[in-house]
């Protein structure tokens, strides 16, 4: 699966909107590496 | 509103550097990759590379790999791009970008800085 | 690094036209492919990620369609903002690269 930046982005994005946004504060493409999907 | 504001532009000679800044404002700056892309005269857009402001970890395209320098002053969320060795192929609009998620999911894009290499 | 080939480079069309721009990828991409318009002497403004899907705000005439190498964007009815010039961009693969952009003209 694709681990470039972008590609970490949109699925985090993804990822969020079909929690509703209830993830841990800390949860943003900048601290989540790949390994977190 | 998240906004990406570019230094002015720039003249240059051949074989000095540059220095670009992107000034981020409306989002937490520290959240996202910041990309800088590049745009000669009537040329393809070309990737320069990205970094994490977080952390300060990059990607460069190798066609820049020693000659491009990205760093971040996260304190005043800022980011940069420097040039090195600079020569007349390097006469370009070069932008800022960054992909945010909150509070809008958009691509925002700077203004552009254009740099012109000329003796 | 992976080659972006839009196709054609520019068209000419009319209001209220389809428009179907082309992007090959010369590898697979899966659907980690951009689009985006370009007026002159402005920044690249995004249009579509993810193949297709599109950000909000951009009017739902845009539709983008494609997976591995093969990409489309895709004017439903050509509105007179939207000549402009259009890149594809991939981001499966470091460096990222662009094809070098599709001008929509005035016929």
């Known amino acids: 699966s694709c681990n470039t930046a972008t590609c970490v982005t949109h699925r985090l994005a993804g990822l969020l909107s079909r929690s509703g946004g209830v993830v841990k504060d800390n949860f943003v493409p900048t601290n989540v590496g790949s390994e977190a999907f | 509103e998240v906004q990406l504001v570019q230094s002015g532009a720039e003249v240059k000679k051949p074989g000095a550097s540059v220095k670009v800044s992107c000034k981020a404002s409306?989002?937490?700056?520290?959240?996202?990759?910041m990309n800088w892309v590049r745009q000669a005269p009537g040329q393809c857009l070309e990737w320069i590379g990205d970094i994490n402001p977080n952390q300060g970890g990059t990607n460069y395209n190798q066609k820049f790999k020693g000659r491009a320098t990205l760093t971040v002053d996260k304190s005043a969320s800022t980011a940069y791009m420097e040039l090195s060795s600079l020569r007349s192929e390097d006469t370009a609009v070069y932008y800022c970008?960054?992909?945010?998620?909150?509070?809008?999911?958009?691509?925002?894009w700077g203004q552009g800085t254009t740099v012109t290499v000329s003796s | 690094d992976i080659q972006m080939t839009q196709s054609p480079s520019s068209l000419s069309a009319s209001v209220g036209d389809r428009v179907t721009i082309t992007c090959k990828a010369s590898q697979n991409v899966d659907t980690n492919v951009a689009w985006f318009q370009q007026k002159p002497g402005k920044a690249p403004k995004s249009l579509i990620y993810s193949a297709s899907y599109r950000y909000s705000g951009v009017p739902s005439r845009f539709s983008g369609s494609g997976s591995g190498t093969d990409f489309t964007l895709t004017i439903s009815s050509l509105q007179p903002e939207d000549f402009a010039t259009y890149y594809c961009?991939?981001?499966?693969?470091?460096?990222?690269?662009f094809g070098c952009g599709t001008k929509v003209e005035i016929k």
């Open positions: 970008a960054s992909i945010i998620i909150v509070p809008n999911y958009f691509d925002y």
């Open positions: 409306g989002y937490t700056f520290t959240d996202y990759y």
């Open positions: 961009q991939q981001y499966n693969n470091y460096p990222y690269t």
